[in-house]
Protein backbone atom coordinates (compact mmCIF):
# COMPACT_ATOMS: atom_id res chain seq x y z
CA UNK A 1 0.00 0.00 0.00
CA UNK A 2 1.20 3.50 -0.81
CA UNK A 3 0.91 4.53 2.83
CA UNK A 4 3.14 6.23 5.42
CA UNK A 5 4.87 2.96 6.31
CA UNK A 6 6.10 2.64 2.72
CA UNK A 7 6.19 6.19 1.38
CA UNK A 8 7.76 8.03 4.32
CA UNK A 9 10.52 5.43 4.47
CA UNK A 10 11.47 5.49 0.77
CA UNK A 11 12.44 8.29 -1.60
CA UNK A 12 9.79 7.75 -4.25
CA UNK A 13 9.17 9.81 -7.40
CA UNK A 14 6.13 7.70 -8.26
CA UNK A 15 2.70 8.15 -6.74
CA UNK A 16 3.02 8.06 -2.96
CA UNK A 17 1.71 9.58 0.25
CA UNK A 18 3.41 12.90 1.09
CA UNK A 19 3.43 14.63 4.47
CA UNK A 20 1.45 17.88 4.72
CA UNK A 21 0.64 19.78 7.89
CA UNK A 22 -2.26 22.20 7.55
CA UNK A 23 -2.66 25.10 9.98
CA UNK A 24 -6.38 25.94 9.96
CA UNK A 25 -5.96 29.72 10.36
CA UNK A 26 -2.86 30.29 8.27
CA UNK A 27 -3.43 27.79 5.47
CA UNK A 28 -7.22 27.76 5.15
CA UNK A 29 -8.32 31.01 6.76
CA UNK A 30 -10.56 28.99 9.09
CA UNK A 31 -10.96 30.72 12.45
CA UNK A 32 -13.84 28.66 13.77
CA UNK A 33 -11.94 25.53 14.81
CA UNK A 34 -10.74 25.89 18.38
CA UNK A 35 -8.80 22.63 18.64
CA UNK A 36 -6.63 21.33 17.10
CA UNK A 37 -4.79 24.33 15.62
CA UNK A 38 -3.87 22.21 12.63
CA UNK A 39 -3.38 18.60 11.59
CA UNK A 40 -1.39 16.20 9.42
CA UNK A 41 -3.64 16.11 6.36
CA UNK A 42 -1.05 14.56 4.00
CA UNK A 43 -1.55 14.46 0.24
CA UNK A 44 -0.86 12.24 -2.75
CA UNK A 45 1.58 13.10 -5.53
CA UNK A 46 3.96 11.51 -8.02
CA UNK A 47 4.06 9.82 -11.39
CA UNK A 48 1.77 6.95 -12.37
CA UNK A 49 3.74 4.64 -14.66
CA UNK A 50 2.22 1.42 -16.00
CA UNK A 51 1.04 -0.92 -13.21
CA UNK A 52 2.09 1.42 -10.39
CA UNK A 53 -0.76 0.88 -7.94
CA UNK A 54 -3.41 1.35 -10.61
CA UNK A 55 -6.95 1.64 -9.32
CA UNK A 56 -8.95 0.43 -12.34
CA UNK A 57 -8.53 -1.17 -15.75
CA UNK A 58 -8.99 2.31 -17.23
CA UNK A 59 -6.10 3.77 -15.22
CA UNK A 60 -3.89 0.87 -16.35
CA UNK A 61 -4.89 1.46 -19.96
CA UNK A 62 -4.28 5.18 -19.56
CA UNK A 63 -0.81 4.73 -18.06
CA UNK A 64 0.16 2.36 -20.87
CA UNK A 65 -1.28 4.80 -23.42
CA UNK A 66 0.73 7.60 -21.81
CA UNK A 67 3.95 5.55 -21.92
CA UNK A 68 3.54 4.85 -25.63
CA UNK A 69 2.19 8.36 -26.38
CA UNK A 70 4.21 10.55 -23.95
CA UNK A 71 3.19 13.73 -25.77
CA UNK A 72 -0.49 13.08 -24.96
CA UNK A 73 -2.12 14.95 -22.09
CA UNK A 74 -4.11 11.90 -20.99
CA UNK A 75 -2.55 10.23 -17.97
CA UNK A 76 -3.64 8.80 -14.64
CA UNK A 77 -3.28 10.87 -11.49
CA UNK A 78 -2.09 10.12 -7.98
CA UNK A 79 -5.02 10.58 -5.58
CA UNK A 80 -6.17 9.58 -2.12
CA UNK A 81 -7.35 6.04 -1.45
CA UNK A 82 -7.97 5.55 2.27
CA UNK A 83 -9.05 8.51 4.37
CA UNK A 84 -9.69 8.98 8.08
CA UNK A 85 -11.75 11.49 10.05
CA UNK A 86 -10.49 14.28 12.28
CA UNK A 87 -12.09 15.17 15.63
CA UNK A 88 -12.40 18.91 16.23
CA UNK A 89 -13.59 21.23 18.97
CA UNK A 90 -15.49 24.40 18.05
CA UNK A 91 -17.92 26.77 19.73
CA UNK A 92 -21.42 27.96 18.95
CA UNK A 93 -21.66 30.98 21.25
CA UNK A 94 -20.26 29.68 24.52
CA UNK A 95 -21.31 26.09 23.82
CA UNK A 96 -18.41 23.76 23.01
CA UNK A 97 -19.08 21.17 20.34
CA UNK A 98 -17.01 18.15 19.52
CA UNK A 99 -17.49 16.75 16.01
CA UNK A 100 -15.85 14.43 13.59
CA UNK A 101 -15.03 15.81 10.14
CA UNK A 102 -15.04 12.80 7.82
CA UNK A 103 -12.37 12.09 5.17
CA UNK A 104 -9.92 14.72 6.37
CA UNK A 105 -6.69 12.72 6.64
CA UNK A 106 -5.18 10.80 3.72
CA UNK A 107 -3.71 7.47 4.77
CA UNK A 108 -2.84 5.96 1.37
CA UNK A 109 -2.78 6.74 -2.34
CA UNK A 110 -3.54 5.16 -5.72
CA UNK A 111 -3.24 5.95 -9.41
CA UNK A 112 -6.68 6.69 -10.83
CA UNK B 1 -22.22 15.73 -13.18
CA UNK B 2 -18.97 16.21 -15.07
CA UNK B 3 -20.09 13.85 -17.83
CA UNK B 4 -20.33 13.95 -21.62
CA UNK B 5 -23.67 15.76 -21.55
CA UNK B 6 -22.05 18.68 -19.71
CA UNK B 7 -18.36 18.52 -20.65
CA UNK B 8 -18.59 17.83 -24.39
CA UNK B 9 -21.05 20.70 -24.77
CA UNK B 10 -19.03 23.32 -22.90
CA UNK B 11 -15.49 24.62 -23.27
CA UNK B 12 -14.24 23.92 -19.77
CA UNK B 13 -10.73 24.46 -18.36
CA UNK B 14 -11.75 22.98 -15.03
CA UNK B 15 -11.97 19.26 -14.32
CA UNK B 16 -14.17 17.63 -16.94
CA UNK B 17 -14.58 14.53 -19.08
CA UNK B 18 -12.44 14.67 -22.24
CA UNK B 19 -12.88 12.52 -25.35
CA UNK B 20 -10.17 9.94 -26.04
CA UNK B 21 -10.28 7.17 -28.63
CA UNK B 22 -7.80 4.36 -27.99
CA UNK B 23 -6.70 2.08 -30.83
CA UNK B 24 -5.61 -1.16 -29.15
CA UNK B 25 -2.75 -1.95 -31.53
CA UNK B 26 -1.43 1.53 -32.19
CA UNK B 27 -1.88 3.11 -28.77
CA UNK B 28 -1.37 0.16 -26.41
CA UNK B 29 0.60 -2.37 -28.46
CA UNK B 30 -2.15 -4.91 -27.71
CA UNK B 31 -2.56 -7.39 -30.55
CA UNK B 32 -4.76 -9.92 -28.76
CA UNK B 33 -8.10 -8.13 -28.98
CA UNK B 34 -9.85 -9.04 -32.24
CA UNK B 35 -12.88 -6.77 -31.89
CA UNK B 36 -13.35 -3.89 -31.43
CA UNK B 37 -10.20 -2.39 -32.94
CA UNK B 38 -10.44 0.44 -30.44
CA UNK B 39 -12.91 2.27 -28.23
CA UNK B 40 -13.90 5.61 -26.72
CA UNK B 41 -12.08 5.37 -23.39
CA UNK B 42 -12.30 9.08 -22.50
CA UNK B 43 -10.27 10.62 -19.68
CA UNK B 44 -10.50 13.27 -16.98
CA UNK B 45 -8.45 16.45 -16.96
CA UNK B 46 -8.61 20.06 -15.87
CA UNK B 47 -8.10 22.30 -12.85
CA UNK B 48 -9.70 21.62 -9.48
CA UNK B 49 -10.46 25.03 -7.94
CA UNK B 50 -12.16 25.29 -4.56
CA UNK B 51 -15.54 23.51 -4.49
CA UNK B 52 -15.35 22.36 -8.13
CA UNK B 53 -16.92 18.90 -7.89
CA UNK B 54 -14.86 17.92 -4.86
CA UNK B 55 -15.07 14.29 -3.89
CA UNK B 56 -14.17 14.46 -0.18
CA UNK B 57 -13.58 16.90 2.66
CA UNK B 58 -9.87 16.37 2.10
CA UNK B 59 -10.07 17.40 -1.56
CA UNK B 60 -12.04 20.51 -0.55
CA UNK B 61 -9.43 21.34 2.10
CA UNK B 62 -6.64 20.72 -0.41
CA UNK B 63 -8.16 22.96 -3.08
CA UNK B 64 -8.64 25.75 -0.52
CA UNK B 65 -5.08 25.23 0.74
CA UNK B 66 -3.87 25.43 -2.86
CA UNK B 67 -5.80 28.67 -3.43
CA UNK B 68 -4.19 30.29 -0.38
CA UNK B 69 -0.78 28.67 -1.03
CA UNK B 70 -0.55 28.63 -4.85
CA UNK B 71 3.19 27.86 -4.76
CA UNK B 72 2.51 24.58 -2.96
CA UNK B 73 2.62 21.32 -4.88
CA UNK B 74 -0.32 19.88 -2.96
CA UNK B 75 -3.52 20.11 -4.97
CA UNK B 76 -6.48 17.89 -5.85
CA UNK B 77 -6.57 16.08 -9.16
CA UNK B 78 -9.24 15.46 -11.78
CA UNK B 79 -9.95 11.71 -11.94
CA UNK B 80 -12.59 9.25 -13.11
CA UNK B 81 -15.79 8.82 -11.13
CA UNK B 82 -18.20 6.53 -13.00
CA UNK B 83 -16.83 3.81 -15.27
CA UNK B 84 -18.39 1.27 -17.60
CA UNK B 85 -17.22 -2.07 -19.01
CA UNK B 86 -16.22 -2.88 -22.57
CA UNK B 87 -17.15 -6.13 -24.33
CA UNK B 88 -14.35 -7.61 -26.43
CA UNK B 89 -13.78 -10.58 -28.73
CA UNK B 90 -10.45 -12.41 -28.64
CA UNK B 91 -9.11 -15.81 -29.61
CA UNK B 92 -7.18 -18.56 -27.86
CA UNK B 93 -6.02 -20.71 -30.76
CA UNK B 94 -9.10 -20.95 -33.00
CA UNK B 95 -11.55 -20.60 -30.12
CA UNK B 96 -13.39 -17.25 -30.03
CA UNK B 97 -14.03 -15.78 -26.58
CA UNK B 98 -16.35 -12.91 -25.71
CA UNK B 99 -15.63 -11.20 -22.39
CA UNK B 100 -16.31 -7.98 -20.53
CA UNK B 101 -13.36 -5.91 -19.38
CA UNK B 102 -14.60 -4.00 -16.35
CA UNK B 103 -14.00 -0.28 -15.72
CA UNK B 104 -12.68 0.52 -19.19
CA UNK B 105 -14.76 3.56 -20.17
CA UNK B 106 -14.90 6.77 -18.12
CA UNK B 107 -18.37 8.30 -17.98
CA UNK B 108 -17.81 11.14 -15.47
CA UNK B 109 -15.12 12.88 -13.44
CA UNK B 110 -14.47 14.36 -9.99
CA UNK B 111 -11.79 16.29 -8.10
CA UNK B 112 -10.10 14.01 -5.62
Amino acid sequence: ALDAAYCFRNVQDNCCLRPLYIDFKRDLGWKWIHEPKGYNANFCAGACPYLWSSDTQHSRVLSLYNTINPEASASPCCVSQDLEPLTILYYIGKTPKIEQLSNMIVKSCKCS
Amino acid sequence: ALDAAYCFRNVQDNCCLRPLYIDFKRDLGWKWIHEPKGYNANFCAGACPYLWSSDTQHSRVLSLYNTINPEASASPCCVSQDLEPLTILYYIGKTPKIEQLSNMIVKSCKCS
Epitope: L51, R60, L64, I68 | L28, G29, W30, K31, W32, I88, Y90, Y91, I92, G93, K97, E99, L101
Partner: antibody, heavy 122, light 109 residues
Framework: QVQLVQSGAEVKKPGASVKVSCKAS????????MHWVRQAPGQGLEWMGW????????NYAQKFQGRVTMTRDTSISTAYMELSRLRSDDTAVYYC???????????????WGQGTMVTVSS | SYVLTQPPSVSVAPGKTARITCGGN??????VHWYQQKSGQAPVLVIY???ARPSGIPERFSASNSENTATLTIRRVEAGDEADYYC???????????FGGGTQLTVLG
Protein backbone atom coordinates in the same frame (compact mmCIF):
# COMPACT_ATOMS: atom_id res chain seq x y z
CA GLN C 1 8.77 -2.52 -2.35
CA VAL C 2 7.43 -4.93 -4.96
CA GLN C 3 9.52 -8.10 -4.89
CA LEU C 4 9.60 -11.84 -5.43
CA VAL C 5 11.83 -13.82 -3.07
CA GLN C 6 12.66 -17.41 -3.96
CA SER C 7 13.78 -20.36 -1.86
CA GLY C 8 17.42 -21.42 -1.69
CA ALA C 9 19.55 -23.62 -3.92
CA GLU C 10 18.81 -27.35 -4.13
CA VAL C 11 20.86 -30.42 -5.00
CA LYS C 12 18.82 -33.43 -6.12
CA LYS C 13 19.42 -36.95 -7.39
CA PRO C 14 18.08 -38.05 -10.79
CA GLY C 15 14.50 -39.30 -10.51
CA ALA C 16 13.76 -37.12 -7.45
CA SER C 17 11.45 -34.08 -7.28
CA VAL C 18 12.15 -30.48 -6.35
CA LYS C 19 9.75 -27.82 -5.07
CA VAL C 20 10.75 -24.18 -5.40
CA SER C 21 8.84 -21.39 -3.65
CA CYS C 22 8.36 -17.75 -4.64
CA LYS C 23 7.06 -15.30 -2.03
CA ALA C 24 5.46 -12.11 -3.36
CA SER C 25 5.29 -8.85 -1.44
CA UNK C 26 4.41 -5.22 -2.09
CA UNK C 27 1.49 -5.89 -4.45
CA UNK C 28 -1.83 -7.73 -4.73
CA UNK C 29 -0.73 -11.33 -5.26
CA UNK C 30 -4.01 -12.37 -6.92
CA UNK C 31 -3.81 -9.60 -9.52
CA UNK C 32 -0.88 -11.06 -11.48
CA UNK C 33 -0.04 -14.31 -13.22
CA MET C 34 3.00 -16.04 -11.76
CA HIS C 35 5.24 -17.59 -14.40
CA TRP C 36 8.18 -19.93 -14.05
CA VAL C 37 11.15 -19.60 -16.38
CA ARG C 38 14.33 -21.64 -16.27
CA GLN C 39 17.85 -21.14 -17.58
CA ALA C 40 20.34 -23.97 -17.97
CA PRO C 41 24.03 -23.03 -17.51
CA GLY C 42 25.18 -20.94 -20.49
CA GLN C 43 21.78 -21.28 -22.17
CA GLY C 44 18.81 -19.02 -22.86
CA LEU C 45 15.52 -18.47 -21.04
CA GLU C 46 12.85 -21.18 -21.26
CA TRP C 47 9.22 -20.59 -20.21
CA MET C 48 7.74 -23.44 -18.18
CA GLY C 49 4.20 -22.28 -17.45
CA TRP C 50 2.00 -19.97 -15.40
CA UNK C 51 -0.46 -20.07 -12.55
CA UNK C 52 -3.34 -17.66 -12.04
CA UNK C 53 -3.17 -17.09 -8.27
CA UNK C 54 -6.73 -15.81 -8.28
CA UNK C 55 -8.29 -19.05 -9.57
CA UNK C 56 -5.47 -21.57 -9.26
CA UNK C 57 -5.73 -22.19 -13.01
CA UNK C 58 -2.52 -23.25 -14.75
CA ASN C 59 -1.03 -23.51 -18.22
CA TYR C 60 2.14 -25.54 -18.71
CA ALA C 61 4.50 -25.56 -21.67
CA GLN C 62 4.08 -28.77 -23.68
CA LYS C 63 7.65 -29.84 -22.85
CA PHE C 64 6.94 -29.95 -19.10
CA GLN C 65 3.40 -31.34 -19.21
CA GLY C 66 3.08 -34.26 -16.78
CA ARG C 67 6.28 -33.38 -14.90
CA VAL C 68 5.54 -29.90 -13.56
CA THR C 69 2.96 -28.80 -11.01
CA MET C 70 2.35 -25.16 -10.12
CA THR C 71 0.41 -24.28 -6.98
CA ARG C 72 -0.11 -21.26 -4.77
CA ASP C 73 -1.04 -20.34 -1.21
CA THR C 74 -2.84 -16.99 -1.31
CA SER C 75 -2.82 -16.68 2.50
CA ILE C 76 0.96 -16.23 2.41
CA SER C 77 1.23 -14.80 -1.15
CA THR C 78 3.47 -17.64 -2.26
CA ALA C 79 3.66 -19.59 -5.51
CA TYR C 80 5.28 -23.02 -5.86
CA MET C 81 6.76 -24.94 -8.76
CA GLU C 82 7.37 -28.67 -8.39
CA LEU C 83 9.31 -30.57 -11.03
CA SER C 84 9.36 -34.35 -10.79
CA ARG C 85 11.39 -37.17 -12.35
CA LEU C 86 14.45 -34.95 -12.45
CA ARG C 87 17.18 -35.53 -15.03
CA SER C 88 20.66 -34.08 -15.26
CA ASP C 89 19.51 -31.70 -18.03
CA ASP C 90 17.06 -30.12 -15.55
CA THR C 91 20.09 -28.51 -13.88
CA ALA C 92 19.28 -24.82 -14.19
CA VAL C 93 18.42 -21.58 -12.44
CA TYR C 94 14.64 -21.44 -11.97
CA TYR C 95 13.01 -18.00 -11.89
CA CYS C 96 9.53 -16.90 -10.95
CA UNK C 97 8.23 -13.77 -12.67
CA UNK C 98 4.91 -11.95 -12.58
CA UNK C 99 2.79 -10.50 -15.39
CA UNK C 100 -0.42 -8.52 -15.08
CA UNK C 101 -3.57 -10.60 -15.03
CA UNK C 102 -5.59 -9.50 -18.04
CA UNK C 103 -7.77 -12.06 -19.80
CA UNK C 104 -4.67 -13.39 -21.53
CA UNK C 105 -1.04 -13.57 -20.37
CA UNK C 106 0.15 -11.09 -22.98
CA UNK C 107 1.78 -8.67 -20.53
CA UNK C 108 5.52 -8.55 -19.92
CA UNK C 109 7.33 -10.04 -16.92
CA UNK C 110 7.94 -6.81 -15.04
CA UNK C 111 9.24 -8.29 -11.77
CA TRP C 112 11.49 -11.35 -11.44
CA GLY C 113 12.65 -13.42 -8.48
CA GLN C 114 16.37 -13.69 -7.79
CA GLY C 115 16.47 -17.26 -9.11
CA THR C 116 16.94 -20.67 -7.49
CA MET C 117 19.79 -22.92 -8.61
CA VAL C 118 18.72 -26.56 -8.90
CA THR C 119 21.50 -29.06 -9.49
CA VAL C 120 20.63 -32.61 -10.52
CA SER C 121 23.54 -34.95 -10.01
CA SER C 122 24.09 -38.53 -8.96
CA SER D 1 5.08 -23.97 -31.84
CA TYR D 2 6.09 -20.36 -32.51
CA VAL D 3 9.82 -19.71 -32.98
CA LEU D 4 11.74 -16.47 -32.33
CA THR D 5 15.17 -16.15 -33.93
CA GLN D 6 17.88 -13.83 -32.58
CA PRO D 7 21.50 -13.43 -33.68
CA PRO D 8 23.76 -15.11 -31.08
CA SER D 9 26.00 -12.05 -30.75
CA VAL D 10 26.27 -8.39 -31.65
CA SER D 11 29.37 -6.24 -31.11
CA VAL D 12 29.44 -2.45 -31.00
CA ALA D 13 31.87 0.31 -30.10
CA PRO D 14 31.03 2.61 -27.17
CA GLY D 15 28.96 5.60 -28.24
CA LYS D 16 27.63 3.85 -31.33
CA THR D 17 24.20 2.33 -31.99
CA ALA D 18 23.45 -1.36 -31.44
CA ARG D 19 20.52 -3.07 -33.15
CA ILE D 20 19.35 -6.49 -32.01
CA THR D 21 16.78 -8.27 -34.16
CA CYS D 22 14.13 -10.83 -33.29
CA GLY D 23 12.61 -12.69 -36.22
CA GLY D 24 9.32 -14.54 -36.20
CA ASN D 25 6.55 -15.38 -38.64
CA UNK D 26 4.21 -12.34 -38.71
CA UNK D 27 5.74 -11.09 -35.45
CA UNK D 28 4.19 -7.71 -36.24
CA UNK D 29 0.84 -9.23 -35.23
CA UNK D 30 2.19 -10.06 -31.78
CA UNK D 31 3.24 -7.87 -28.84
CA VAL D 32 6.99 -8.11 -28.22
CA HIS D 33 8.78 -7.60 -24.90
CA TRP D 34 12.53 -7.25 -24.44
CA TYR D 35 14.68 -8.22 -21.43
CA GLN D 36 18.25 -7.44 -20.47
CA GLN D 37 20.19 -10.01 -18.45
CA LYS D 38 23.58 -9.13 -17.03
CA SER D 39 25.95 -11.90 -15.99
CA GLY D 40 24.79 -13.74 -12.87
CA GLN D 41 21.62 -11.65 -12.50
CA ALA D 42 17.90 -12.08 -13.11
CA PRO D 43 16.51 -10.59 -16.33
CA VAL D 44 15.19 -7.02 -16.32
CA LEU D 45 12.38 -5.72 -18.53
CA VAL D 46 13.62 -2.97 -20.87
CA ILE D 47 10.80 -2.70 -23.44
CA TYR D 48 7.20 -3.91 -23.30
CA UNK D 49 4.34 -3.96 -25.81
CA UNK D 50 6.66 -3.35 -28.79
CA UNK D 51 7.92 0.10 -27.77
CA ALA D 52 6.91 1.10 -24.23
CA ARG D 53 9.84 1.76 -21.89
CA PRO D 54 9.53 1.10 -18.14
CA SER D 55 10.42 3.94 -15.81
CA GLY D 56 14.11 3.76 -14.94
CA ILE D 57 15.15 2.47 -18.36
CA PRO D 58 17.20 5.11 -20.25
CA GLU D 59 15.70 6.81 -23.31
CA ARG D 60 18.62 5.37 -25.28
CA PHE D 61 16.62 2.13 -25.41
CA SER D 62 13.89 1.97 -28.05
CA ALA D 63 12.24 -0.71 -30.16
CA SER D 64 10.05 -1.32 -33.17
CA ASN D 65 8.04 -4.23 -34.52
CA SER D 66 6.64 -4.83 -38.00
CA GLU D 67 6.01 -7.71 -40.38
CA ASN D 68 8.52 -10.47 -39.56
CA THR D 69 11.11 -8.61 -37.48
CA ALA D 70 11.17 -6.81 -34.14
CA THR D 71 14.23 -4.67 -33.38
CA LEU D 72 15.71 -3.42 -30.12
CA THR D 73 17.85 -0.32 -30.65
CA ILE D 74 20.37 0.94 -28.09
CA ARG D 75 21.79 4.36 -28.92
CA ARG D 76 25.03 5.77 -27.52
CA VAL D 77 26.00 2.36 -26.19
CA GLU D 78 27.83 2.26 -22.85
CA ALA D 79 29.98 -0.44 -21.26
CA GLY D 80 27.17 -1.05 -18.75
CA ASP D 81 24.85 -2.15 -21.59
CA GLU D 82 26.94 -5.30 -22.10
CA ALA D 83 24.49 -8.15 -21.42
CA ASP D 84 22.32 -10.81 -23.00
CA TYR D 85 19.09 -9.53 -24.55
CA TYR D 86 15.97 -11.65 -25.05
CA CYS D 87 12.78 -10.98 -26.98
CA UNK D 88 9.53 -12.62 -25.84
CA UNK D 89 5.95 -12.92 -27.07
CA UNK D 90 2.68 -14.54 -26.08
CA UNK D 91 1.60 -16.85 -28.90
CA UNK D 92 -2.21 -16.81 -28.95
CA UNK D 93 -2.32 -19.80 -31.32
CA UNK D 94 -0.73 -22.15 -28.77
CA UNK D 95 -1.37 -20.05 -25.61
CA UNK D 96 2.35 -20.37 -24.89
CA UNK D 97 4.94 -17.77 -23.98
CA UNK D 98 8.02 -17.90 -26.15
CA PHE D 99 11.53 -16.47 -25.73
CA GLY D 100 14.08 -15.85 -28.43
CA GLY D 101 17.42 -17.62 -28.07
CA GLY D 102 19.09 -14.46 -26.76
CA THR D 103 21.73 -12.12 -28.14
CA GLN D 104 25.00 -11.40 -26.36
CA LEU D 105 25.83 -7.72 -26.73
CA THR D 106 29.55 -7.02 -26.48
CA VAL D 107 30.80 -3.45 -26.07
CA LEU D 108 34.22 -3.25 -27.71
CA GLY D 109 37.27 -1.67 -26.14
Amino acid sequence: QVQLVQSGAEVKKPGASVKVSCKASGYTFTGYYMHWVRQAPGQGLEWMGWINPNTGGTNYAQKFQGRVTMTRDTSISTAYMELSRLRSDDTAVYYCARSFLWLVPSDAFDIWGQGTMVTVSS
Amino acid sequence: SYVLTQPPSVSVAPGKTARITCGGNNIGFRSVHWYQQKSGQAPVLVIYFDRARPSGIPERFSASNSENTATLTIRRVEAGDEADYYCQVWDSDSDDLVFGGGTQLTVLG
